[in-house]
């Protein structure tokens, strides 16, 4: 018996089509994914194949205005369109708060969206029962599936659950979900879920009867053969884990951003094992039209969009320097107002302990595009913070040794005056350089923001502890020649939209103004 | 649990046709095929042919003539219909599933006067 | 058809031993190779499915490899249990089995 999974993750309310690097579509020819390209190729495989699933291993929400704008209301309408049989919670679904999921999202979907590790307690036990289940058995043809969710437990740290919601180990909480389906004569078992290719190797490995595993969050690319596109494969199509029980898993996940389908036929012998299993992700290129009616529904839903990129967000009564005469080469405000929102995007106080689990930031002065001049009003807009981050890139969480961190900061300024983007903006971090010195040994103090205190102070970098930092995306995959950060980088886990950060930040402060305060010297 | 339950005569004349009945439990044959294979006394295993989930079957060349699978999926069987047998066909007939994973406990059929 | 060349036919060993037992197809069967296990009161058994997977219950003592042609049958420390005659078994076009190999007490 033969099941197709069709199957997407970490799309990150990539709604409607971008270009290839995910960012906003500019030549339409050349662009790529969106729910409307999806549902054709969906269609056309569920038309040529008798047993097809369409699953989403998490993290729908967060991403682009699309998002800021409908907070999860898009997700569960244009996933109903879709017709998907399934998903798993991801971290960013919770990026609003257990209200922002529940309302939008798990009380207007109309397929089952899981997670065994979450438990919820105190009163959100019964207002969110039933909304989101361990399991689902889902008939396919005259055969019956089991599809178990799991999410990332360090969802604590990175989106906002509350404190009614308990993240369990997720090799635990499987184990026993997956023998009471095995009880229900439910042979054949997906482990659905967003803790990253690691632990979805793990869950392959050990929970007893999963048979397949589809995965996210770390945006894992996977191909057979040659790659249609600019990812790099981090090994095959379907990567085969041999389990504690000498059974072969196929652990799958499709890149991110709905630029692929990920692909995957399974084979079932009768008592439910895997005989075979094959695939590759599908590019969603140009190729493939985009479907009339979801494309109408799509620029229906666009017209509120619009509107919102000229709304107040709120004011600023400083000039926000973000002029490449200024972040590429000193401390400058719209660096601090950035590095700042990014912080205070992350504060999560989930430990008497720490004051926060993160204290620092860093912001390559190159990403930062434009000024904002105060002088219109102090009037702060989307459309006026797009232009200073323009690129759709995240604020992520790392976790770096002090060793590395000293390493980017000499990066910082190895060719210092030449008006180049690796020149670093800071929050939590106070940094002194020496020019006169030779490139590789200018940083003559580097203090760090304490995050285990009460009380915030600095403190020298301390080589061989490992830090939390809040970075953008693009220096933590190594870009402006930050190879240290992704070649020793601990732990990365993707944040939220970079714009939504700084917009959030805005509107909760209504009134800004930012100083230069001797965090660079 | 899957199972597969064989039912049929164990002695058989010269010239007459085995019927053996094969009964599937814990899978559905609209999901599944079943095959069949012998094994004569003291030799390795045959196969005789398979009944596929659609309906259809295949047949080993050598018995093609007198071979006979069909299934009524509503009863959850498979017969074997073998007709014209010889003492030579003096086996242990199984039944199995499609991949091989469960098998039916074995007929021993005698063919003989 | 697939032939299925299955060697050796039989082989005596002690309990401790490590028991191993080929096969090899006439063609790439893509490993699509089962190992079966019948005791002497006729019963069969799958032991190992897609070439290398095992089947549920089967102790880990038993492992299976290969690809292509050459299909391998590995019991890393023979139990009395096990004394039983092994067959492999390709489904990559219809069924064709090996010849057996029976395990005997040394």
């Known amino acids: 018996w033969e099941l197709t999974i069709l199957h997407t993750n970490d799309v990150h309310s990539r709604l409607e089509q971008t270009s290839e690097d995910s960012s906003k579509c500019v030549n339409a020819s050349r662009c790529m994914g969106g729910v409307a390209r999806l549902f054709t190729k969906v269609q056309q495989i569920r038309r040529a194949e008798p047993n097809v699933l369409l699953l989403d291993a998490g993290d729908q929400y967060q991403g682009t205005i699309w998002f800021t704008v409908y907070k999860g209301a898009e997700v569960a309408h244009f996933m109903n369109a879709l017709r998907y049989d399934a998903m798993a919670l991801g971290n960013h679904e919770f990026d609003n708060g257990v209200e922002g999921l529940i309302e939008p999202l798990l009380k207007e979907a109309k397929f089952p969206i899981l997670s065994a590790n979450i438990k919820a307690k105190g009163p959100l036990a019964s207002q969110i029962s039933g909304l989101y289940l361990p399991y689902k058995v889902l008939p396919v043809g005259d055969e019956v599936v089991g599809i178990v969710g799991y999410t990332s437990k360090e969802t604590p740290f990175l989106s906002n659950p509350g404190t009614n919601l308990v993240f369990e180990d997720e090799i635990t909480a499987l184990q026993p979900e997956v023998d009471k389906l095995k009880t229900l004569n439910v042979n054949k078992i997906i482990a659905l879920g967003h803790s990253g290719f690691e632990m979805d190797k793990l869950i392959a490995q050990k929970v007893r009867g999963v048979d397949v595993v589809v995965g996210g969050h770390s945006n894992t690319f996977l191909y057979t053969g040659n790659p249609p596109s600019k990812e790099v494969p981090a090994g095959k199509y379907p990567f085969i884990v041999t389990s504690d029980d000498g059974r072969k898993v196929p652990v799958v996940q499709a890149y991110a951003f709905g630029k692929y389908l990920g692909y995957l036929k399974i084979e079932f012998d009768e008592r439910g094992n895997v005989i075979s299993s094959h695939g590759n992700p599908i590019l969603l290129n140009s190729s493939i039209p985009e479907d009339p009616s979801i494309k109408a529904d799509i620029n229906k839903w666009r017209i509120k969009l619009d509107n919102y990129s000229t709304q107040e967000l709120g004011k600023t009564i400083v000039y926000l320097d973000g002029s490449s005469q200024s972040c590429r080469f000193r401390e400058c405000n719209m660096g601090n107002l950035i590095c700042d929102a990014m912080i205070n995007n992350n504060l999560r106080h989930t430990d008497e302990m720490f004051w926060n689990h993160v204290s620092m930031c860093i912001l390559n002065g190159g990403g930062i595009r434009s000024p904002i001049d105060e002088r219109n009003n102090g009037t702060i807009t989307w459309e006026n913070l797009a232009a200073v981050l323009p690129f759709g890139g995240t604020f992520d969480l790392v976790q770096l040794k002090g060793s590395t961190l000293k390493k980017a900061f000499e990066h910082s300024v190895h060719r210092y005056g030449q008006s180049t983007g690796e020149f670093l903006q800071v929050g939590g971090i106070h940094v002194v350089y020496d020019l006169s010195r030779k490139p590789g040994d200018r940083v003559v103090k580097l203090d760090v923001l304490c995050t285990k205190c009460r009380v915030p102070s600095y403190d020298p970098l301390k080589m061989d502890e490992v830090y939390k930092v809040i970075l953008p995306n693009f220096l933590a995959n190594g870009g402006d020649g930050f190879q240290m950060i992704k070649d020793e980088l601990l732990r990365h886990d993707s944040g939220d939209q970079d714009i939504n950060v700084v917009s959030t930040y805005i509107s909760k402060m209504k009134v800004i103004y930012p100083a230069v305060e001797g965090r660079i010297k | 649990e899957v199972t597969l339950k064989q039912s049929g005569p164990g002695l058989v004349k010269p010239t007459e046709t085995l019927t053996l009945t094969c009964t599937v439990s814990?899978?559905?044959?609209?999901?599944?095929?079943i095959q069949w294979v012998r094994q004569p006394p003291g030799k390795g295993l045959e196969w005789l042919g398979v009944?596929?989930?659609?309906?259809?079957?295949d047949y080993n060349a050598a018995f093609i003539s007198r071979l006979t699978i069909s299934k009524d999926t509503s009863k959850s069987q498979v017969v074997l219909t073998m007709t014209n047998m010889d003492p030579v066909d003096t086996a242990t007939y199984y039944c199995a599933g499609q991949y091989g994973s469960v098998w039916g406990q074995g007929t021993l059929v005698t063919v003989s006067s | 058809d697939i032939q299925m060349t299955q060697s050796p036919s039989s082989l005596s060993a002690s309990v401790g031993d490590r028991v191993t037992i080929t096969c090899r197809a006439s063609?790439?069967?893509?490993?699509?190779l089962n190992w079966l296990q019948q005791k002497p009161g006729g019963a069969i058994k799958r032991l190992i499915y897609a070439t290398s997977s095992l089947d549920s219950g089967v102790p880990s003592r038993f492992s299976g490899s290969g690809s292509g042609t050459e299909y391998t049958l590995t019991i890393s420390s023979l139990q009395p249990e096990d004394f039983a005659t092994y067959y492999c078994l390709q489904y990559a076009g219809s069924w064709t089995f090996g010849g057996g190999t029976k395990v005997e007490i040394k």
């Open positions: 063609q790439d069967i893509g490993d699509r």
């Open positions: 814990g899978f559905s044959l609209s999901s599944y095929g």
């Open positions: 009944i596929w989930s659609g309906g259809s079957a």
